[in-house]
Interface confidence: low
């Protein structure tokens, strides 16, 4: 289990939290922050928050944007403050690269 953790870990970051899952809080602590955009019943739903454990965000953060959902992840205090996830536009290709920073 200990071998699974990143080299610099478990540094907790302060992340901006926006969306229903945040309750009354405007921040959360986690090993990764994220900013996401999804389409739900035709509406754009923006969310920001954190993954408590690195493994939680591992697959989500690696997933390339699709027409219905985009997630950008980062590591650093408040690093998701100015990140706004964007859905891919028609004709634009998105390579499946990781969007978060690992030391």
């Amino acid at each position: 289990m200990e071998d699974e953790k990143p080299k610099v870990n478990p540094k907790l970051y302060m992340c901006v939290c926006e969306g229903l899952s945040c309750g009354n809080e405007d921040h959360c602590e986690g090993q990764q922050c994220f900013s996401s955009l999804s389409i739900n019943d035709g509406f754009h739903v923006y969310q920001k928050g954190c993954f408590q454990v690195y493994e939680q965000g591992k697959m989500t953060c690696k997933t390339p944007p699709s027409p219905g959902q985009a997630v950008e992840c980062c590591q650093g205090d408040w690093c998701n403050r100015n990140i706004t996830a964007q859905l891919p536009t028609k004709g634009k290709s998105f390579p499946g690269t990781q969007n978060f920073h690992l030391e």
Epitope: L12, M14, C79
Partner: antibody, heavy 119, light 113 residues
Framework: EVQLVESGGGLVQPGRSLRLSCAAS????????MHWVRQAPGKGLEWVSV????????DYADSVKGRFTISRDNAKNSLFLQMNSLRPEDTALYYC????????????WGQGTLVTVSS | DIVMTQSPDSLAVSLGERATINCKSS????????????LAWYQQKPGQPPKLLIY???TRESGVPDRFSGSGSGTDFTLTISSLQAEDVAVYYC?????????FGGGTKVEIK
């Protein structure tokens, strides 16, 4: 006013166990990661363990790994350190410390509780 | 583990004079993505717990007198007391919070000459 009050220290024989408690008040306890830091008599500071606000992330110094267990009860605003298989080198003043909201440094400390491991 | 080395071990300074404490980390504590140095300074007076003075290497904690200042980046850091007061007699510690295990310097004892 933020207050952290440790208890549970005392004289214990090598190999025995002890459970430290830290009662927190004056801040929203379940918003913050909490740490234990110790200080051997006349020596410097040594970080012991951390627990995140929701207990999802826990880590220990190598010197106590496998022997000490950190836990918390957010409903009771309490932090704990279960110390098993105690050694003479564990003799120290044990502080509980509140993590600052911006990083893993400590903006509030308790007064400490003294643990003496001796036969 | 990141090893923190403080110098000198002790320091005797006249009242009103400048006191300078050095702290060196065995590897950089500068986090490139946010340009922050993950380093804090504490003051510990006899019989008391440590008190936070400085974080992010140079940000003074609220309520800390402005005669205390922190500087440095990467691996080399300095805590300066610009004009030593009697109440500044204490042991000062640096701490890195870049990675676990969190580690402290050995401490520098500041006394009045």
């Amino acid at each position: 006013e933020v207050q952290l009050v440790e208890s549970g220290g005392g004289l214990v024989q090598p190999g025995r166990s002890l459970r430290l408690s830290c009662a927190a008040s004056g801040f929203t306890f379940d918003d913050y990661g909490m740490h234990w830091v110790r200080q051997a008599p006349g020596k410097g500071l040594e970080w012991v363990s951390v627990i995140s606000w929701n207990s999802a992330t826990i880590d220990y110094a190598d010197s106590v790994k496998g022997r000490f267990t950190i836990s918390r009860d957010n409903a009771k605003n309490s932090l704990f350190l279960q110390m098993n298989s105690l050694r003479p080198e564990d003799t120290a003043l044990y502080y509980c410390a509140k993590k600052n909201s911006l990083g893993w440094f400590f903006d509030y400390w308790g007064q400490g509780t003294l643990v003496t491991v001796s036969s | 583990d990141i090893v923190m080395t403080q110098s000198p071990d002790s320091l005797a300074v006249s009242l009103g004079e400048r006191a300078t404490i050095n702290c060196k980390s065995s590897q950089s504590v500068l986090y490139s993505s946010n340009d922050n140095n993950y380093l804090a300074w504490y003051q510990q007076k006899p019989g008391q717990p440590p008190k936070l003075l400085i974080y992010w290497a140079s940000t003074r904690e609220s309520g800390v007198p402005d005669r205390f200042s922190g500087s440095g980046s990467g691996t080399d850091f300095t805590l300066t007391i610009s004009s030593l007061q009697a109440e500044d007699v204490a042991v000062y510690y640096c701490q890195q919070y870049y990675s676990t295990p969190l580690t402290f310097g050995g401490g520098t004892k500041v006394e009045i000459k």
